[in-house]
């Protein structure tokens, strides 16, 4: 057993039919020695007296709000949670796999440059009774700053007979030099609690392997005289890091016909601008790419070639 | 991913073709390391990130961008005090401070050369014989050292008298190509930056 | 005491279903998740299936994918495996088994696919 | 396609010490825990070790678990006649998990 925080324990068990679970021993935050008395939750049958409560905890009905009394008076509070174990692996009944990039991914992080500015974000299909807590650090021996806010609701979607809802929180690291080697990850802890189940997930990463660039701005076209080819500009995005010439781009630029099944064109170029030929009905679409380490591309930013 | 690749003008800073083909070479040669030693743990998430150059040189510092010398993150971590000197800061593109920055590459590839030589030297005991450098990656970093043009003493390449641990010297492998490839991507932005200066 | 009953096992031609039971007791069912495995004549064991404890979620094996459904009526304390288009080489003895550090095992119950 | 391997059989005589291994790799066996299990004829699998050195109790203690790095081991001090059966590891892999993954099975005989 361990505190999560104050009056909040959470009690590990192995969980398997049968288990025989753990003994806890509760004591009453009180100077008071007599006349005391315990409740669980909102009943008021009396599960035992003195200022300690024994305990054998087996199953979610033994977890729960135990409450020492006297005198129809509240003393304090103990809420217990259980984190099951399951064959030797920490239960993850609460956030969905997102199997991407690979199976039991359960959080995802993005940064749309190397200020140490990043956003997690998670998927649930449990709508209430539902609480998140971040944290993180840059390394875990001899953790440096990362300052997280509270994770919100992010979205909501239907998938099949279910609605899902997605979660997100956005973490600063508290001295981050964009230019810097990352030589230790960091670590990203999601404590999650719904009713009285206890799960923490955790994510470990470097920023430049989650690089993801916003999309080129300003995309513009420019007919050239006498010929069905167009030139295409656009712009660093503003929140990529600068300066540009040391945090470069390259660019792929695509053809796209009105139909899916069209033969898509595409250039990979460094520079802001291409030559392209522009067909009718097609839209022209740019997306970018850190120049050096290859980590994701943005999305892509589109215009018509009407 | 095969990109087509531009050919530098004439007039272009001439280290930065060379960083491009160390870049493409080192992360080739990492990409066949992990394929090939795929029963080893040869992934970023799995070895530990070591940086054989760590206080010897200081290329992110001797190589920053000006507008990151503003950056308290930046600079916290700098033996190189000069830097700091507000007239340094001011004349950030002089020739010294260039200087500077690439002897610092320079001592960097130097350092990585020999540790690549005395572990290829290894592997190629491997009666395995499942892994070895990839020549065109040592000949890169051969035509950086010598388009950087900078004279210092040859370091001896290191010799061990005892049998050598393949297991071992696999591994360590994968942890220098791993820094290695994120110092071709500093020094490639260096270049880059350079360039446009 | 924990115990699981199995039954639905017989002989079946290829191309037709069956549906296994595997009736729990002396445990909170709801609370568990649950696996089917399989064992070919001679052969060693093979995991085939696993729902969680709300069946929420089912895994299968590449084998049985797309044919077989694992299934479970908690208010039943039941867990089900639905057999469609059954193969010779689904020729087994089925076990129902409970997941945990410590498991129980349903006796088994033989299904022969054979024209 | 069995990941987890084992050798077909093994034997001793009464008193010896058999041990029967497991190799695996370092996405399954090397990140997760082993369990053992003993399957006598025409019977259900029975657990002798969990968490890849526990024994559950009414399994004798002549049976003991190890790991190491991606393989574990089954040893059985003083083989005894009622030990003839047959024997799988099981583990899971990091992204299959809660796939099941047994080993390919040992037959343990015992001479004599």
């Known amino acids: 057993i361990w505190e999560l925080k104050k009056d909040v324990y959470v009690v590990e068990l192995d969980w398997y039919p049968d288990a025989p679970g753990e003994m806890v021993v509760l004591t009453c935050d009180t100077p008071e020695e007599d006349g005391i008395t315990w409740t669980l939750d909102q009943s008021s049958e009396v599960l035992g007296s003195g200022k300690t409560l024994t305990i054998q905890v087996k199953e979610f009905g033994d977890a729960g709000q135990y409450t020492c009394h006297k005198g129809g008076e509240v003393l304090s509070h103990s809420l217990l949670l259980l984190h099951k174990k399951e064959d030797g692996i920490w239960s993850t009944d609460i956030l969905k796999d997102q199997k991407e990039p690979k199976n039991k991914t359960f959080l995802r992080c993005e940064a749309k440059n190397y200020s140490g500015r990043f956003t997690c974000w998670w998927l649930t299909t449990i709508s209430t009774d539902l609480t998140f807590s971040v944290k993180s650090s840059r390394g875990s021996s001899d953790p440096q700053g990362v300052t997280c806010g509270a994770a919100t609701l992010s979205a909501e979607r239907v998938r099949g007979d279910n609605k899902e809802y997605e979660y997100s929180v956005e973490c600063q690291e508290d001295s981050a030099c964009p230019a810097a080697e990352e030589s230790l990850p960091i670590e990203v802890m999601v404590d999650a609690v719904h009713k009285l189940k206890y799960e923490n997930y955790t994510s470990s990463f470097f920023i430049r392997d989650i690089i993801k660039p916003d999309p080129p701005k300003n995309l513009q076209l420019k007919p050239l005289k006498n010929s069905r080819q167009v030139e295409v500009s656009w712009e660093y995005p503003d929140t990529w890091s600068t300066p540009h010439s040391y945090f470069s781009l390259t660019f792929c630029v695509q053809v796209q016909g009105k139909s899916k099944r069209e033969k898509k064109d595409r250039v990979f170029t460094d520079k802001t601008s291409a030559t392209v030929i522009c067909r009718k009905n097609a839209s022209i679409s740019v997306r970018a790419q850190d120049r050096y380490y290859s980590s994701s591309w943005s999305e892509w930013a589109s215009v018509p070639c009407s | 991913r095969n990109l087509p690749v531009a050919t530098p003008d004439p007039g272009m800073f001439p280290c930065l073709h060379h960083s491009q083909n160390l870049l493409r070479a080192v992360s080739n040669m990492l990409q066949k390391a992990r394929q090939t030693l795929e029963f080893y743990p040869c992934t970023s998430e799995e070895i530990d990130h070591e940086d054989i150059t760590k206080d010897k040189t200081s290329t992110v510092e001797a190589c920053l961008p000006l507008e990151l010398t503003k950056n308290e993150s930046c600079l916290n971590s700098r033996e190189t005090s000069f830097i700091t000197n507000g007239s340094c800061l001011a004349s950030r593109k002089t020739s010294f401070m260039m200087a500077l920055c690439l002897s610092s590459i320079y001592e960097d590839l130097k350092m990585y050369q020999v540790e690549f030589k005395t572990m290829n030297a290894k592997l190629l005991m491997d009666p395995k014989r499942q892994i070895f450098l990839d020549q065109n990656m040592l000949a890169v970093i051969d035509e950086l050292m010598q388009a950087l043009n900078f004279n210092s003493e040859t370091v001896p390449q290191k010799s061990s008298l005892e049998e050598p641990d393949f297991y071992k010297t696999k591994i360590k492998l994968c942890i220098l190509l791993h820094a290695f490839r994120i110092r071709a991507v500093t020094i490639d932005r260096v270049m880059s930056y350079l360039n446009a200066s | 005491q924990v115990q699981l009953v199995q039954s639905g096992g017989g002989v079946v031609q290829p191309g037709r279903s069956l549906r296994l039971s595997c009736a729990a007791s002396g445990f909170t069912f709801s609370s568990y998740g649950m696996h089917w495995v399989r064992q070919a004549p001679g052969k060693g064991l093979e995991w085939v299936a696993f729902?969680?404890?709300?069946?929420?979620?089912?895994y299968y094996a590449d084998s049985v994918k797309g044919r077989f459904t694992i299934s479970r009526d908690n208010s039943k304390n039941t867990l089900y495996l639905q057999m469609k288009s059954l193969r010779a080489e689904d020729t087994a003895v089925y076990y129902c088994?409970?997941?945990?550090?410590?498991?129980?095992w349903g006796q088994g119950t033989m299904v022969t696919v054979s024209s | 396609s069995y990941v987890l391997t084992q050798p077909p059989s093994v034997s001793g005589t009464p008193g010896q010490r058999v041990t029967i291994s497991c190799s695996g790799g370092?996405?399954?066996?090397?990140?997760?825990?082993v369990k053992w299990y003993q399957q006598l004829p025409g019977t259900a699998p029975k657990l002798l070790i969990y968490?890849?050195?526990q024994r559950p109790s009414g399994v004798p203690d002549r049976f003991s678990g190890s790991k190491s790095g991606t393989s574990a081991s089954l040893a059985i001090t003083g083989v005894q006649a009622e030990d003839e059966a047959d024997y799988y590891c099981?583990?899971?892999?990091?992204?299959?998990?809660?796939?099941?993954?047994f080993g390919t099975g040992t037959k343990v005989t015992v001479l004599g």
């Open positions: 370092r996405s399954n066996i090397g990140s997760n825990c």
């Open positions: 729902i969680r404890y709300d069946g929420s979620n089912k």
């Open positions: 088994k409970t997941h945990g550090s410590h498991d129980n």
């Open positions: 099981q583990s899971y892999d990091r992204g299959t998990h809660p796939a099941l993954l």
């Open positions: 968490g890849n050195d």
